[in-house]
Interface confidence: low
């Protein structure tokens, strides 16, 4: 008799793929633009990335550091009107993109939470949650919660409001903290909260260190759903050298949880390459005319247009990974097992029942390495075959689809491999 199929877990929409943050509408849309109507015109691009949700804003009225002049129910007229917002929601819905609204109150000011008037602000947030849920948003984000006194209890209350409206609504909290204990204490009292943090932000050093961070986090959070990013708002290039961007894209898309990216991560957008542009929100490079300040500063391979035409680009890799992440059961909700593969390497398996399985091997080092995959670290349910097919490499030059002998696996510097192999009874 055929073995019984494992029961599928309940999956929410944010379990099925990546979230895409657009914190700065003006920077995302570029010169002379920066409103909700313009963003609506970019939804096809978001669809092409196969992201499941758009984390937007903040876009509410906020006169910096002035609680009285901060209105979480009003859209700053610079961004557009409620009608524009409604139209954006409807268009996003048609394209199956959910919209999450950032309600970080004092986003233009010194302290995101007006430290001296916590209760007033908390009431405003509560009112705003009700208001925007009725308006049709799919969830909320609040950032810098380390600046919010009694954050855990407020988050629990806001989570109740959000989930009380519908189980299909999401609350994301962001913190600058990278401390696991602080992160766990925020998660403890808030079931289903998606938390973005700086936990992985210093992971770029070695494969061992990254493996240790990831496994510690997964062990500590148990079977709750995680999110993966390097910070609550900033670009990957703020933390990573260019040569590790592909590796991290592969890792973030294949770890168990929701990958969260900032606009521009898909093309390796780097503020440091654009003089005068703010680190946390450089202008999005749609094409070479997107940054006219310094002629010649932007080459085609830095832009969406240029990378769209190049199958070997970072953007093309992002699209492929996003596609795989959203349709393969083992990547959607499969079990995760990390195992030893040798110094400098981080490797793991994703598998779900009798579905196709995935092996990820990541070389964080700047020298080529032979992988010594220690299959003995794996449980019987996740055993390794002798060969696996190469689905993709982060580096050019490998023949995709070809079977690779796992005992003889060699990786280039900063190379990541995604291999697939069938379930074997």
């Amino acid at each position: 008799r055929a073995p019984r199929c494992r029961e599928l877990p309940a999956q929410k929409w944010w379990h099925t793929g990546a979230l895409y943050r657009i914190g700065d509408l003006q920077a995302f849309q570029g010169h002379g633009a920066g409103n909700l109507a313009g963003l609506k015109g970019r939804l096809d691009y978001l669809s092409s990335l196969k992201v499941k949700g758009l984390v937007l804003g903040p876009i509410h009225k906020n006169q910096k550091d002035d609680v009285a002049q901060t209105d979480l129910l009003q859209i700053d007229p610079n961004f557009g009107s409620k009608e524009d917002f409604d139209s954006l929601l409807q268009s996003a819905k048609k394209k199956s993109i959910r919209v999450i609204l950032d309600l970080t109150p004092n986003y233009r000011g010194e302290n995101s939470w007006f430290s001296t008037q916590v209760d007033t602000v908390a009431t405003k947030v509560k009112d705003a949650l009700e208001f925007w849920l009725q308006a049709g948003v799919d969830g909320f984000q609040v950032r810098d919660i380390e600046n919010l006194k009694d954050a855990s209890s407020f988050l629990a209350e806001w989570q109740n409001i959000t989930k009380g409206f519908s189980e299909d609504r999401l609350l994301i909290a962001g913190t600058n903290s990278s401390d696991l204990q602080q992160i766990l204490s925020l998660l403890e009292s808030n079931k289903d909260l998606l938390l973005t943090s700086s936990y992985l932000s210093d992971s770029g050093s070695t494969g061992e260190h990254t493996k240790s961070l990831v496994t510690q986090y997964l062990n500590a959070t148990g079977n709750r759903w995680c999110s993966w990013s390097l910070s609550q708002a900033r670009l990957l290039t703020s933390f990573l050298p260019a040569q590790l961007l592909r590796l991290y894209q592969l890792m973030l898309f294949t770890l168990p949880g929701t990958p969260v990216f900032s606009y521009g991560d898909e093309i390796g957008l780097d503020a440091a390459a654009l003089p005068g542009q703010p680190m946390e929100a450089p202008v999005m490079l749609w094409d070479e005319s997107s940054f006219p300040d310094i002629p010649g500063a932007v080459s085609a391979n830095m832009t969406v247009k240029g990378q769209s035409e190049d199958p070997g680009s970072l953007l093309s890799l992002f699209r492929r990974l996003s596609d795989q992440r959203s349709k393969e059961r083992s990547l959607l909700h499969g079990d995760f097992h990390a195992f030893s593969a040798g110094p400098g390497l981080f490797s793991y398996i994703r598998h779900w029942d009798q579905n196709e399985r995935f092996l990820v091997v990541l070389n964080f080092g700047d020298v080529g390495l032979s992988a010594g995959l220690q299959a003995s670290d794996l449980p019987a349910s996740a055993s390794l075959p002798a060969k696996a097919d190469l689905l993709l490499s982060t580096q050019p030059g490998r023949e995709e689809g070809s079977p690779l002998e796992l005992e003889r696996l060699k990786l280039e510097p900063h190379e990541g491999l995604l291999l697939r192999f069938p379930y074997a009874a």
Partner: antibody
Framework: QVQLQESGPGLVKPSQTLSLTCTVS??????????WSWIRQHPGKGLEWIGY???????YYNPSLKSRVTISLDTSKNQFSLKLSSVTAADTAVYYC?????????????WGQGTLVTVSS | QSALTQPASVSGSPGQSITISCTGT?????????VSWYLQHPGKAPKLMIY???NRPSGISTRFSGSKSGNTASLTISGLQAEDEADYYC??????????FGGGTKLTVL
């Protein structure tokens, strides 16, 4: 309350480099998306924007002074600095440091009290 | 970058209203709503009076108002008072991510 205070020599010889420092108190220079700027005012004349450094370290300068100006940030001391090379008597002015921002709040809300720099041999 | 153009001086009697103009180009005043106005008394640092064309910071009298049409911004002071006598400067952010100031206007209260 944020306060800015300029410091540096009041007298600089022609062809030398003018160096000024602005010390920021009441807030961290690296904590928000602010434009830390230098502005000068020639005696009896109007204000002239020299340049800014963003908290991330990015700089922008007045095109007419660009070849001679360097603005830098020292987050450990909560200071930012101005260097103006190859000075002449035309660089004699009151030099102000000021803050704009964050993000789209593109006006100067905090100013130092100004320091007079005279270029003379 | 050229300075914004302001009249060198304006004057008015107490209680009257005066308007100071500030003319720029399509790269600054016309392009953005990032026009600000500053008051400066002799020997003092400038003080922000108006930002984003027409907004007043807290503590600034409602007698001060700002507006813009095309590439010209204006500062109006109503109910002129003796303490309003000072130099006034306009400023704009520019499309080159720089700032530019006006030449300044000396306001005399007669």
């Amino acid at each position: 309350q944020v306060q800015l205070q300029e410091s540096g020599p009041g007298l600089v010889k022609p062809s030398q480099t003018l160096s000024l420092t602005c010390t920021v108190s009441g807030g961290s220079i690296s904590s928000g998306a602010y434009y830390w700027s230098w502005i000068r005012q020639h005696p009896g004349k109007g204000l002239e924007w020299i340049g800014y450094i963003y908290y991330s370290g990015s700089t922008y300068y007045n095109p007419s002074l660009k070849s001679r100006v360097t603005i830098s940030l020292d987050t450990s001391k909560n200071q930012f600095s101005l260097k103006l090379s190859s000075v002449t008597a035309a660089d004699t002015a009151v030099y102000y440091c000021a803050r704009a921002g964050p993000k789209w709040e593109l006006w100067f809300d905090y100013w130092g009290q100004g320091t007079l720099v005279t270029v003379s041999s | 970058q050229s300075a914004l153009t302001q009249p060198a001086s304006v004057s008015g009697s107490p209680g009257q209203s005066i308007t100071i103009s500030c003319t720029g180009t399509s790269s600054d005043v016309d392009n953005y709503n990032y026009v600000s106005w500053y008051l400066q008394h002799p020997g003092k640092a400038p003080k922000l009076m108006i930002y984003d064309v027409s907004n007043r910071p807290s503590g600034i009298s409602t007698r001060f108002s700002g507006s813009k049409s095309g590439n010209t911004a204006s500062l109006t002071i109503s109910g002129l008072q003796a303490e309003d006598e000072a130099d006034y400067y306009c400023s704009s952010f520019t499309s080159s991510s720089t700032w530019v100031f006006g030449g300044g206007t000396k306001l005399t209260v007669l």
